[in-house]
Amino acid sequence: GITNINCSGHIWVEPATIFKMGMNISIYCQAAIKNCQPRKLHFYKNGIKERFQITRINKTTARLWYKNFLEPHASMYCTAECPKHFQETLICGKDISSGYPPDIPDEVTCVIYEYSGNMTCTWNAGKLTYIDTKYVVHVKSLETEEEQQYLTSSYINISTDSLQGGKKYLVWVQAANALGMEESKQLQIHLDDIVIPSAAVISRAETINATVPKTIIYWDSQTTIEKVSCEMRYKATTNQTWNVKEFDTNFTYVQQSEFYLEPNIKYVFQVRCQETGKRYWQPWSSPFFHKTPETVPQVTSKAFQHDTWNSGLTVASISTGHLTSDNRGD
């Protein structure tokens, strides 16, 4: 970067090289060039010469003042106009950054995706800081009192093999950058309560010719968890509102779910599951599209026929035999 150049003087920033976005800042440039009493000192920001708010302090030093500086990053350098020199002489350069101290991390969540071998912890980091912000995830066993710390820039995957202190833990997150430090509330977890079953996947759909045509959705999961509750949501692609069916599921065989749908309409289906009675759900599966026939013939849709889709649509909840409509956010 600009900081690696050979300097013939010194450039510095007040209050600091990393400062809070929106602050007024001063950049100082002091020349130390042999046989040069600078006629003028010039400042450049990202290669553009600055025209305004430059004040000469003394023979060798000038100040550039910025009001309400809002750029996350800028490369600054300054030059001198030396008598009898045709070109400006480079004095020095510095990269500057502006941003915010971290917010208190909240919504700390830790889950174990079945078969992953990891406990995945995530949190809401709050507003964008614009500057390098690190997170330390603290995991403390409630049985042994032993504490482990994990440094990361976003979420963290912790090997379940490293969680040797029993089943109960406290987890909290510390956020820190050059402008400040904050700590989340503590989350108490039990490893058995945070397992999310292996992903449920819709494999195919078929519409069977009958007096009232019926669509069967085939879906499955590789989970070994015995008691699993699932939700399937579906809607016509032109609709905003999801319909939701709930199931208590045993994945020893492929699931078949029946739906009575309007003819000649393109539908989208998604499924998600959780260990019955536990807190965390799987994310919704990839959208599965199926178009019902106009009238009689049998139509099959397979998983490889998926269109791409924004899966961040709307949510639902279910119990066997019930059909509900739900407009809640995910």
């Epitope: 553009i48 010469k49 305004f52 430059i54 003394n58 008598p83």
Partner: antibody, heavy 119, light 107 residues
Framework: EVKLVESGGGLEQPKGSLKLSCTVS????????MSWVRQAPGKGLDLVAD??????????YYADSVKDRFTISADDSQSMVYLEMDNLKTEDTALYYC??????????WGQGVMVTVSS | DIQMTQSPASLSASLGETVSIECLAS??????LAWYQQKPGKSPQLLIY???SLQDGVPSRFSGSGSGTQYSLKINSLESEDAATYFC?????????FGGGTKLELK
């Protein structure tokens, strides 16, 4: 040879508008700043508006007395500089010079164009 | 903005004389000073820049000097064509600012 030719002056009523033009030739337009400097009758010289060179990203400056009323612009394809003057006041009456600056001192000047604001 | 105070406002001198015009800056301008000559009905012409550098084509009887806040323009052996108004300009800090002018008349 550097040449600057102003046009567009004249008599205008208070609150009226005028647009001054300056045709420039004989130098690299992008390497120089262009300014309008005015001289009220029997008075000194005042920088009114400035459009800086490419190295300054064409930053513009306006004297406090004309801020939000005057607009300086340049058309490098035509080698023209303009000064749009709105909401004119009697104190804007002056001879307006188009000038060129490479460093900050004004190296070249046009012949000037008279603007008279009177009811 | 830097203020430039020029003196005298006017002066009268004879052919062949030497005259000096002063310019005082409100703060150190580090030799970033230019001098202009404006003849009646004409646009200003650059005489001197960087306090003492003579612009091409300007007669050598014109010279500039000074440092810090005080600068002067000296005209040796006055000639009739030197009757004009002279302005100083600081370009140390933006925006550049002019002195009020000195009107030189020849007796």
């Amino acid at each position: 040879e550097v040449k600057l030719v102003e046009s567009g002056g004249g008599l205008e009523q208070p609150k009226g508008s005028l647009k001054l033009s300056c045709t420039v030739s004989g130098f690299d337009f992008n390497s120089y700043g262009m300014s309008w400097v005015r001289q009220a009758p029997g008075k000194g010289l005042d920088l009114v508006a400035d459009i800086n060179s490419k190295s300054y990203n064409y930053a513009t400056y306006y004297a406090d007395s004309v801020k939000d009323r005057f607009t300086i612009s340049a058309d490098d394809s035509q080698s023209m500089v303009y000064l749009e003057m709105d909401n004119l006041k009697t104190e804007d009456t002056a001879l307006y010079y188009c000038t060129v600056h490479h460093s900050d001192y004004f190296e070249y000047w046009g012949q000037g164009v008279m603007v008279t604001v009177s009811s | 903005d830097i203020q430039m105070t020029q003196s005298p406002a006017s002066l009268s001198a004879s052919l062949g004389e030497t005259v000096s015009i002063e310019c005082l800056a409100s703060e150190d301008i580090y030799n970033n000073l230019a001098w202009y000559q404006q003849k009646p009905g004409k646009s200003p012409q650059l005489l001197i820049y960087h306090a003492s550098s003579l612009q091409d084509g300007v007669p050598s009887r014109f010279s500039g000097s000074g440092s810090g806040t005080q600068y002067s323009l000296k005209i040796n052996s006055l000639e009739s064509e030197d009757a004009a108004t002279y302005f100083c300009l600081q370009d140390s800090e933006y925006p550049p600012t002019f002195g009020g002018g000195t009107k030189l008349e020849l007796k």
